[in-house]
């Protein structure tokens, strides 16, 4: 019996087609993805093949003006229209709190939404019960397939799930649910979830009875053969893991932003064992036409967005590199721009001894969600900025000891190379790392811009000195693992909305040209 698994993950509000780098579509003939194009390909496969499942591994929420305006209603509407069979909850599904998940998505979805390792407690338990499920048995052709969901247990650090949801260890939570499916005579089981590629592989290895793992969160691109676009494969598609009980378990992920449709064919024997698996992500480029009915619907929903944020704020004459490939690995000029805007927004010349009360900015690279292409006449709109900074956060003022900052910069690179969001972009700081050293001892130089000076210059960080720093509220609250900031901050004052800070700066400057200038080495 053959099953076709079509899968997406980390779509992040890319309902419309995008440029190749997943930013706003500029030249339509070269644009990719979007739900109208996705639907064309899905329908083509549904017509050609008998047993097809369309699955999403989480993080539909957050990323463009679509989410800013529609707050998840767009996700439910268009996923319903595409007839998704199931979705796993991602961390970003909690960005507007639990209510922001329940009202627009959980109540409106016509497909099961899954997570076995999220347990509700208190009054929320009844309110949310039955709206998301640990697993779902789906009829496919003449067979049944069990789908069991999971969500990153880091979600409380990454989003806003509140205090009444407990995020358990994925493997511990999944095993009893898979066992339950076995007792229901379900012998073909897919783990669908959002914890990143490393956890996906662990689930394949450790959870007895899981036949296939469909993942997300780490934006992992897997491909067999010559990749069709810019993404460099992290491994073959599917990635085969040998489980502890000796089975070959295929693990897949489909990059992000709706650029690819994961396409995996699995052959099962009559006892539900995987005999073979093969496939590849399908690049959703302009050779695939956009479905006219979905496109018309998109255009109808688009009207509200056009009124929202299309006026020009200013211009850029350089490419604003906000790609995760840059901002999570090295200094990126988008990070420099944002940090400069954050400092500029906090210029307060209240003391003759100080040129300003604050000179430093830190910004988690994972918080930068999109680049901006200068080739659109250099125009920057609120909409462009909403794709870069989609989380609706604030840029806050904190006071920290030098020793806390040192810990923060060690944390920034403690697992460097895995495209994780904690890599820090900076302003008013020069940092030098030696990545050949062991984690926790990689910061070899950390100089900070003086404030008590008439001519600003860089001096070595003093461990016992108290410094003012501008940073996202996400970091002030210990997000991305920066627990030391939350635990050790001496003062915290909330600031202005992130997009507003950057848009005000761009409007003030009129033309911007941020460079990569050696802040991080």
């Amino acid at each position: 019996w053959e099953l076709t698994i079509l899968h997406t993950n980390d779509v992040h509000s890319r309902l419309e087609q995008t440029s190749e780098d997943s930013s706003k579509c500029v030249n339509a003939s070269r644009c990719m993805g979007g739900v109208a194009r996705l639907f064309t390909k899905v329908q083509q496969i549904r017509r050609a093949e008998p047993n097809v499942l369309l699955l999403d591994a989480g993080d539909q929420y957050q990323g463009t003006i679509w989410f800013t305006v529609y707050k998840g209603a767009e996700v439910a509407h268009f996923m319903n229209a595409l007839r998704y069979d199931a979705m796993a909850l991602g961390n970003h599904e909690f960005d507007n709190g639990v209510e922001g998940l329940i009202e627009p998505l959980l109540k409106e979805a016509k497909f099961p939404i899954l997570s076995a390792n999220i347990k509700a407690k208190g009054p929320l338990a009844s309110q949310i019960s039955g709206l998301y499920l640990p697993y779902k048995v789906l009829p496919v052709g003449d067979e049944v397939v069990g789908i069991v969901g999971y969500t990153s247990k880091e979600t409380p650090f990454l989003s806003n799930p509140g205090t009444n949801l407990v995020f358990e260890d994925e493997i511990t939570a999944l095993q009893p649910e898979v066992d339950k499916l076995k007792t229901l005579n379900v012998n073909k089981i897919i783990a669908l979830g959002h914890s990143g590629f490393e956890m996906d592989k662990l689930i394949a290895q450790k959870v007895r009875g899981v036949d296939v793992v469909v993942g997300g969160h780490s934006n992992t691109f897997l491909y067999t053969g010559n990749p069709p676009s810019k993404e460099v494969p992290a491994g073959k598609y599917p990635f085969i893991v040998t489980s502890d009980d000796g089975r070959k378990v295929p693990v897949v992920q489909a990059y992000a932003f709706g650029k690819y449709l994961g396409y995996l064919k699995i052959e099962f024997d009559e006892r539900g064992n995987v005999i073979s698996s093969h496939g590849n992500p399908i690049l959703l480029n302009s050779s695939i036409p956009e479905d006219p009915s979905i496109k018309a619907d998109i255009n109808k929903w688009r009207i509200k967005l056009d009124n929202y944020s299309t006026q020009e704020l200013g211009k850029t004459i350089v490419y604003l590199d906000g790609s995760s490939q840059s901002c999570r690995f090295r200094e990126c000029n988008m990070g420099n721009l944002i940090c400069d805007a954050m400092i500029n927004n906090n210029l307060r010349h209240t003391d003759e001894m100080f040129w300003n009360h604050v000179s430093m900015c830190i910004l988690n690279g994972g918080g930068i969600r999109s680049p901006i292409d200068e080739r659109n006449n250099g125009t920057i709109t609120w909409e462009n900025l909403a794709a870069v900074l989609p989380f609706g956060g604030t840029f806050d003022l904190v006071q920290l000891k030098g020793s806390t900052l040192k810990k923060a910069f060690e944390h920034s690179v403690h697992r460097y190379g895995q495209s994780t969001g904690e890599f820090l972009q900076v302003g008013g700081i020069h940092v030098v790392y030696d990545l050949s050293r062991k984690p926790g001892d990689r910061v070899v130089k950390l100089d900070v811009l003086c404030t008590k000076c008439r001519v600003p210059s860089y001096d070595p960080l003093k461990m016992d000195e108290v410094y003012k720093v501008i940073l996202p509220n996400f970091l002030a609250n210990g997000g991305d693992g920066f627990q030391m900031i939350k635990d050790e901050l001496l003062r915290h004052d909330s600031g202005d909305q992130d997009i507003n800070v950057v848009s005000t700066y761009i409007s003030k400057m009129k033309v911007i040209y941020p460079a990569v200038e050696g802040r991080i080495k």
Epitope: K107, E108, P112, A125, S126, I128, S129, G130, L131, L133, Y135, K136, V137, P139, G141, D142, E143, V144, L184, N185
Partner: antibody, heavy 120, light 107 residues
Framework: EVQLVQSGAEVKKPGASVKVSCKAS????????MHWVKQAPGQGLEWIGY????????EYNQKFKDKATLTADTSASTAYMELSSLRSEDTAVYYC?????????????WGQGTTVTVSS | DIQMTQSPSSLSASVGDRVTITCRAS??????LNWLQQKPGGAIKRLIY???RLDSGVPSRFSGSRSGTEYTLTISSLQPEDFADYYC?????????FGGGTKVEIK
């Protein structure tokens, strides 16, 4: 299109038995459960139980445990409910309803109903 | 067993009226609730499942809501084809149980 076609009306004497059938089409019979529901004249609905035709697992409402026997023939895509030791209070319309395999969202399609009349 | 108390048992309304039917569960059933429609000929159709979710092909004038253990079916603008009996049904724990029904009649 999902269809559940039930057998025709039955008139039985007290003490007799009756077997009502429910023929499923338009979907894979073993991929869903089958529920049975009673509606006495002028009354509301009462759940009798369900069968999973894949595993043949059966769950009864305790009230009907000694009254109803649920079976299924997967080769014929047909579910059956046998009512034994009939009494006048068993006079009712009996419905079959397709159920969710794992019972998370239940009873989405219903048969047209079979009238069983118990009369001496 | 979980008791489902449905009210009103009958109501008279005109085409275009907004109609609400409520069901109260004797204990917590979360969102494990269906709303069913039974036409005069006896045919039964599920309208809403999981308290809020509309079945395919069901007009958007039907909606479900909840406050604690009280569940509401709302018909925003009653149409001629909506005159029927309506039942709530819980599937949170065995045995599944139904409300007593509400007959919606033409005024």
């Amino acid at each position: 299109e999902v269809q559940l076609v039930q057998s025709g009306a039955e008139v039985k004497k007290p003490g007799a038995s009756v077997k009502v059938s429910c023929k499923a089409s338009g979907y894979t019979f073993t991929s869903y459960t089958m529920h049975w529901v009673k509606q006495a004249p002028g009354q509301g609905l009462e759940w009798i139980g369900y069968i999973n035709p894949n595993s043949f697992y059966i769950e009864y409402n305790q009230k009907f445990k000694d009254k109803a026997t649920l079976t299924a023939d997967t080769s014929a895509s047909t579910a059956y409910m046998e009512l034994s030791s009939l009494r006048s209070e068993d006079t009712a319309v009996y419905y079959c309803a397709r159920g969710d395999y794992d019972l998370f969202y239940d009873m989405d399609n219903w048969g047209q109903g079979t009238t069983v009349t118990v009369s001496s | 067993d979980i008791q489902m108390t449905q009210s009103p048992s009958s109501l008279s309304a005109s085409v275009g009226d907004r109609v609400t039917i409520t069901c109260r569960a004797s204990q917590d059933i979360g969102n494990s609730l269906n709303w069913l429609q039974q036409k005069p000929g006896g045919a039964i159709k599920r309208l809403i499942y999981a308290t809020f979710r509309l079945d395919s092909g069901v007009p958007s004038r039907f909606s479900g809501s909840r406050s604690g253990t009280e569940y509401t079916l709302t018909i925003s603008s009653l149409q001629p084809e909506d005159f029927a009996d309506y039942y709530c049904q819980q599937y949170a724990s065995f045995p599944w149980t139904f409300g007593g029904g509400t007959k919606v009649e033409i005024k």
